[in-house]
């Protein structure tokens, strides 16, 4: 049997289920990559007229699991928010992706009549804030 | 989002009971002793990432537009991930062994999608 662990402070031990995005913990190669994208490239230029382009971030990298056998449980602190869902489970291969609930919108000017009239709209869930192995 | 039923290998939500006793957390998590946390698994073919409800966001749509045009932004993988999570009430000891009852966010995977 394994030796008793030092006292695992409660909710932060949830990092096994809910690792905060700032922690590269065990997945240093899962990161955010920036890309300058024009709406023309996307074929959306007839709809979105401004901005013509934006800095798009996506998540890139591997998520090899290497949890030490006697995982030291974390230090005190409030349960992480934004938090990460359970994924270290049978059959669930962690994946480097944008953390759900942390995507930000992009504010754009759009047209639906070829540029006669304009609307200010919000494209939801477009800007990646955090990447994590989930 | 799809529910895993054993008949699909597409991105779906697999029901899964997390037993705190089995993972040795029953010394600080007082209640519940376990819960259905669930998880996401399955493949995310390119066509699925564009399907509303299967795609997690506009972000996915952007990446997918790139893929369909053969433009590969750093070989972005399409991932089966939680797209909807819910809160669970928990009773636990804090670092000074005071008892805390708290609604902990993002504990339960409700839906999965491709990102």
């Amino acid at each position: 049997s394994t030796p008793p662990m030092s006292w695992p402070w409660s909710p932060s031990a949830l990092r096994l289920l809910q690792r905060p995005p700032e922690e590269p913990a065990a997945h240093a190669n899962c990161h955010r990559v920036a890309l300058n994208i024009s709406f023309q490239e996307l074929g959306w230029e007839r709809w979105i007229v401004y901005p013509p382009s934006f800095i798009f971030h996506y998540c890139h990298g591997g998520c090899g699991l290497h949890i030490p056998p006697n995982l030291p449980l974390p230090v005190p602190g409030a349960p992480p928010t934004p938090a990460q869902p359970p994924s270290l489970l049978p059959g669930a291969q962690p994946c480097c992706a944008a953390l759900p609930g942390t995507m930000r919108p992009l504010h754009v000017r759009t047209t639906s009549d070829g540029g006669y009239s304009f609307k200010y709209e919000t494209v939801p869930n477009l800007l990646t804030q955090h990447c994590a192995c989930i | 989002g799809l529910e895993c039923d054993g008949r699909t290998n597409l991105c779906c939500r697999q029901q899964f009971f997390i037993d705190f006793r089995l993972i040795g957390w029953n010394d600080w998590i007082i209640a519940p002793t376990g819960y259905y946390g669930n998880y996401c698994e399955g493949s995310c073919p390119a066509y699925l990432a564009g399907v509303p409800g299967s795609a997690s966001s506009f972000h996915t749509a952007v990446v997918n537009q790139y893929r369909m045009r053969g433009l590969n932004p750093g070989a972005v993988n399409s991932c089966c991930i939680p797209t909807k999570l819910s809160t669970m009430s928990m009773l636990y000891f804090d670092d000074e062994y005071n008892i805390v009852k708290r609604d902990v966010p993002n504990m339960i995977v409700e839906e999965c999608g491709c990102a």
């Epitope: - | 040795g24 029953n26 010394d27 007082i30 009773l91 005071n98 008892i99 009852k101």
Partner: antibody
Framework: QVQLQQPGAELVKPGASVKLSCKAS????????MYWVKQRPGQGLEWIGM????????NYNGKFKTGATLTVDKSSSTVYMQLSSLTSEDSAVYYC???????????????WGQGTSVTVSS | QIVLTQSPAIMSASLGERVTMTCTAS???????FHWYQQKPGSSPKLWIY???NLASGVPARFSGSGSGTSYSLTISTMEAEDAVTYYC?????????FGGGTKLEIK
């Protein structure tokens, strides 16, 4: 049924140590915290500390941190409390008690041992 | 630590009488984490009322508990001979867990 067995009495000399035992049966030993409570003759109850048999995690009342040590032997479903450098102030009945779930997030010391009477005397 | 003060320390009541004893906490305690234990001479304490107002298994319905914050009470609607023992209040909201000094109930 749940039972917590404790020896009836221990007679020890001042300055010596004593190791009290509490053998559990009738439930899944590793699922419940075990508490220790002190009661001096004619006095009230004092919480000493607690141990979780699954992990060996312990928490002590600051007052007893140096004088009491809680340990567990999973194989025999027994928890122990060692009291060291005993003085007459340590003469008391020591109870072990299971901390159990009453439903709806309610917990309490639901089963108690009969207590071990410790007498410190030369 | 949270100090629990029970009053009175000793009280007498006639059989059939209504009895109320109180427990005052030095700082607020959640009602979920407040219990009462009964102890007969020479015996271990027994859980009597849990989470302020819930009677433990086998406890007669003449007993009741109430309170919140820093003030809690145990009431016996009609005192019976077997009730003449000691009652301890207990909190496990804040560590270290503490007990009151006890109220010894005697027959008048």
């Amino acid at each position: 049924q749940v039972q917590l067995q404790q020896p009836g009495a221990e007679l020890v000399k001042p300055g010596a140590s004593v190791k009290l035992s509490c053998k559990a049966s009738g439930y899944t030993f590793t699922n419940y915290w075990m508490y220790w409570v002190k009661q001096r003759p004619g006095q009230g109850l004092e919480w000493i500390g607690m141990i979780h048999p699954n992990s060996g995690s312990t928490n002590y009342n600051g007052k007893f941190k140096t004088g009491a040590t809680l340990t567990v032997d999973k194989s025999s479903s027994t928890v122990y409390m060692q009291l060291s450098s005993l003085t007459s102030e340590d003469s008391a009945v020591y109870y072990c008690a299971r901390w159990g779930y009453g439903g709806n997030y309610d917990y309490a010391m639901d089963y108690w041992g009969q207590g071990t009477s410790v007498t410190v005397s030369s | 630590q949270i100090v629990l003060t029970q009053s009175p320390a000793i009280m007498s009541a006639s059989l059939g009488e209504r009895v109320t004893m109180t427990c005052t906490a030095s700082s607020s305690v959640s009602s979920s984490y407040f219990h009462w234990y009964q102890q007969k001479p020479g015996s271990s304490p027994k859980l009597w009322i849990y989470s302020t107002s819930n009677l433990a298994s086998g406890v007669p319905a003449r007993f009741s508990g109430s309170g919140s914050g820093t003030s809690y009470s145990l009431t016996i609607s009609t005192m019976e001979a077997e009730d003449a023992v000691t009652y301890y209040c207990h909190q496990y909201h804040r560590s270290p867990w503490t007990f009151g000094g006890g109220t010894k109930l005697e027959i008048k």
